[in-house]
């Protein structure tokens, strides 16, 4: 999906109002220094591409993120503010969701969510630069 036509201001507002709180709740009990940020993004569409990938694409050691509240909210936000996102992405993420087993917050998942927080912060910084 090409995130170029999204309403970035509205996505930022949703992130600051609600998604960020759920990400921080998920990370509770860990320190910001516990993980190094290894994933980066260069502009707003690129940041959303990386956020979409890390949130919804299962990895061998962390397959359960798409069921989390922050993931459901991310999906709703992208569906609302990125025209055409639902048609191309929702069915794919729905299929992934069905393939998942039990919900276990592993260290690897915490690391992945730490990366997500970094990507979202980067997304907001690139937004501020443009304004």
């Amino acid at each position: 999906y090409d995130f170029t036509n999204c309403d970035f201001q509205k996505i930022e507002a949703d992130y600051l109002r609600t998604i960020s709180k759920d990400l921080i709740t998920y990370m509770s009990g860990t320190k910001s220094t516990d993980f190094n940020n290894t994933v980066s993004c260069s502009n707003r569409p690129h940041c959303l591409t990386e956020i979409q990938s890390l949130t919804f694409n299962p990895t061998p050691r962390c397959a359960s993120l798409a069921k989390e509240m922050f993931a459901r909210k991310t999906k709703a936000t992208l569906a609302l503010w990125c025209p055409g996102y639902s048609e191309t992405q929702i069915n794919a993420t729905q299929a992934m969701k069905k393939a998942r087993k039990s919900k276990v917050t592993t260290n690897k998942c915490l690391e992945q969510v730490s990366q997500l927080l970094g990507l979202w912060r980067r997304f907001i910084r690139t937004l501020l630069k443009k304004q």
């Epitope: 459901r72 709703a76 025209p83 055409g84």
Partner: antibody, heavy 120, light 111 residues
Framework: QVQLVQSGAEVKKPGSSVKVSCKAS????????INWVRQAPGQGLEWMGV????????IYAEKFQGRVTITADTSTSTAYMELSSLRSEDTAVYYC?????????????WGQGTLVTVSS | QSALTQPPSASGSPGQSVTISCSGS?????????VSWYQQHPGKAPKLMIY???KRPSGVPDRFSGSKSGNTASLTVSGLQAEDEADYYC???????????FGGGTKLTVL
Amino acid sequence: QVQLVQSGAEVKKPGSSVKVSCKASGFTFGSYGINWVRQAPGQGLEWMGVIVPLVGVTIYAEKFQGRVTITADTSTSTAYMELSSLRSEDTAVYYCARGQEYFYWYFDLWGQGTLVTVSS
Amino acid sequence: QSALTQPPSASGSPGQSVTISCSGSSSDIGGYNRVSWYQQHPGKAPKLMIYDVSKRPSGVPDRFSGSKSGNTASLTVSGLQAEDEADYYCSSYAGTDTFILFGGGTKLTVL
């Protein structure tokens, strides 16, 4: 049973406000969009706005901006539409309608409608 | 005044086909494949008949079909039946600001 049940008919004076409720049952309320659509007597459908409780987003039609407030109480699976500064042309049947989960732009479930009459 | 334009009326005899048009712009119908059609009988709530231009919800007869060309969407009812007599409204997604637009409605009469 999957349904939307709306509050009863209202008669209001010009200049006052009306608050219509829409109680959802049989589905996960928060993930869907709850839209409000009105229909004046003998007229067509007019979209007023939507709320997506999951992310707390509301979008209003430009015509109603500043006069309509849509809210939701996820604990009771109820959405509300409040319209202020009522005038006679606001006399209409007000419907709530469910916008599909993540596909918010089509309405697959409708409430029975609430008749609001504005008259002095 | 509606942002989407529909003919006020259409008619056909039982068994015939009738097509109702819905005209918009590149900002709504032409820009997205997000057109819906609703049927409304007098005194009843509307019912979704077609969504995403041409998809039918379960329970809607396959006599109802939708299509789109450029900025115009169409609803075709084939093999008309008496119970198809109703008002039909088109609707389109219109971007993240306007969100939803409705047509003015078409009264379908089965002769």
